[in-house]
């Protein structure tokens, strides 16, 4: 860490602390060095948010945070002559930013977004309780690969929920998924309080359903081979294979973490396919298979959103009822 003046010497406070918003949810504080700081002091700045969260000691005269502006947020900044956390910083200067004005009961609720198959994002929300039934909503979104804030055009309704979807394709850039999409929903007339959300691109991902390619029997085992949804590598997915037997009326569900096609019975070297062997299946009865997938914690933060079920595929003979 930087050296400098004796730790007991307290520095003057920073000056011209100001705050601004970029994009939709990027809040930036900037400040100037203190006036009359010791000449032998290499300045560092101590900052934390109002609730003593995210303490930081750094030489830069700015700090930013990506935060949904649904609540007031404050930053306190002080100067000191070292990186030592035990050193007492100058008097802390505070600057806050408040959310846009409006009746909190007018703001939309349950604003959430799902990234469908890493190709488009679908957001939905409920109207605020204190709003007119003829309110027209607009959703704005921004992420790093966009130069400016975009307006979502495809507003729809699903029951009581409003929604909007926009294209968002996974970019080959390795850092793309480390970022987030910033979302804001307000009304065209400016009567409701805007609502914000930040959607990390490693969460809320819903894959498309897989596609069953082949079912085959070998002895009393059923071999299932399927194609994974586009845009996903198989090691990033978790699988559920459901097998229904018409004769025994059994309903077996298998949770599959690894679905490699290593067995000689499986078709080899087919890109993006996965395989699973279901043991102890009667070949002379009708067996119906369907599969669904979800992202796993190896590649994504979230592992809660299952895809829809694949189309069913059947194998075997339906016994004639006598």
């Amino acid at each position: 860490g930087g050296g400098g003046a004796a730790p007991t010497e307290t520095q003057p406070p920073v000056t011209n602390l100001s705050v601004s918003v970029e994009n939709l949810c990027t809040v930036i504080w900037t400040w100037n060095p203190p006036e009359g700081a010791s000449s032998n002091c290499s300045l560092w700045y101590f900052s934390h948010f109002g609730d003593k969260q995210d303490k930081k000691i750094a030489p830069e005269t700015r700090r930013s945070i990506e935060v949904p502006l649904n609540e007031r947020i404050c930053l306190q900044v002080g100067s000191q002559c070292s990186t030592n956390e035990s050193e007492k910083p100058s008097i802390l200067v505070e600057k806050c930013i408040s959310p846009p004005e409006g009746d909190p009961e007018s703001a939309v609720t349950e604003l959430q977004c799902i990234w469908h198959n890493l190709s488009y994002m679908k957001c939905s929300w409920l109207p605020g309780r204190n709003t007119s039934p003829d309110t027209n909503y607009t959703l704005y979104y921004w992420h790093r690969s966009l130069e400016k804030i975009h307006q979502c055009e495809n507003i729809f309704r699903e029951g009581q929920y409003f929604g909007c979807s926009f294209d968002l394709t996974k970019v080959k850039d390795s850092s793309f998924e480390q970022h987030s999409v910033q979302i804001m929903v307000k009304d065209n007339a400016g009567k409701i309080k805007p609502s914000f959300n930040i959607v990390p691109l490693t969460s809320r991902v819903k894959p498309d359903p897989p596609h069953i390619k082949n079912l085959s029997f070998h002895n009393d085992d059923l071999y299932v081979q399927w194609e994974n949804p586009q845009n996903f590598i198989s090691r990033c997915l978790f699988y559920e294979v459901e097998v229904n037997n018409s004769q025994t009326e059994t309903h077996n569900v298998f949770y599959v973490q690894e679905a490699k096609c290593e067995n000689p019975e499986f078709e080899r070297n087919v890109e993006n396919t996965s395989c699973f062997m279901v043991p102890g299946v009667l070949p002379d009865t009708l067996n119906t298979v369907r599969i669904r997938v979800k992202t796993n914690k190896l590649c994504y933060e979230d592992d809660k959103l299952w895809s829809n079920w694949s189309q069913e595929m059947s194998i075997g003979k339906k016994r004639n009822s006598t």
Epitope: P133, G159, Y161
Partner: antibody
């Protein structure tokens, strides 16, 4: 056909508990809030509790707050009302209703009678 | 909490008459008012949504009007099957509140 059907009512002693169920059919259940409304014998309608379609937003009337719990299971198309610390004044027919639009009740069940008496 | 006051509490009417029920809100609620009909020993049924929009399947003799604080439910040419209690309900904010009800009796 859109339908809701309540069950679980009955006679219970003061301080006791009861769990009402409401089974829904004929619509995409998770897209709609569900509400419980009650009607004491010979009296008017009183809103009790509402749960949003995905279950994230839950609201209660002051008269039942802390005693009643609303929940839903979207995989079973069912909404529940767990009623604890029941009082004589909770005696009523409890109706389950589907919410629509901006916020009105377009489908009501037949109701289930809850009687709190010693 | 929004308080809704209906008038009259009770009305005895002959068939083919025109009936008017009013509902007054303690503060402005825009068009967030809905009307329900409850026949004896039945559950309530939606008649009018958003103050003036008829709900599907409701006979055309039922109509609603008003906005802000004063609302009216009108039944043109009353029929015997209209004997029921009628309730207005506010859905602006929570709690949802109902009027005390108007009981309509057919002479």
């Amino acid at each position: 056909e859109v339908q809701v059907l309540e069950s679980g009512g009955g006679l219970v002693q003061p301080g006791g508990s009861l769990r009402l169920s409401c089974a829904a059919s004929g619509f995409t259940f998770s897209n709609y809030a569900m509400t419980w409304v009650r009607q004491a014998p010979g009296k008017g309608l009183e809103w009790v509790s509402t749960i949003s379609g995905r279950g994230y937003s839950i609201y209660y009337a002051d008269s039942v707050k802390g005693r009643f719990t609303i929940s839903r299971d979207n995989s079973k198309n069912t909404v529940y009302l767990q009623m604890n610390s029941l009082r004589a004044e909770d005696t009523a027919v409890y109706y389950c209703a589907k919410e629509e639009g901006h916020w009105y009740f377009d489908v009501w069940g037949r109701g289930t009678l809850v009687t709190v008496s010693s | 909490e929004i308080v809704l006051t209906q008038s009259p509490d009770f009305q005895s009417v002959t068939p083919k008459e025109k009936v008017t029920i009013t509902c007054r809100a303690s503060q402005s609620i825009g068009s967030s008012l809905h009307w329900y009909q409850q026949k004896p020993d039945q559950s309530p049924k939606l008649l009018i949504k958003y103050a003036s929009q008829s709900f599907s399947g409701v006979p055309s003799r039922f109509s609603g009007s008003g906005s802000g604080t004063d609302f009216t439910l009108t039944i043109n040419s009353l029929e015997a099957e209209d004997a029921a209690a009628y309730y207005c309900m506010s859905s602006l904010g929570l709690p949802y509140t109902f009027g005390q009800g108007t009981k309509l009796e057919i002479k």
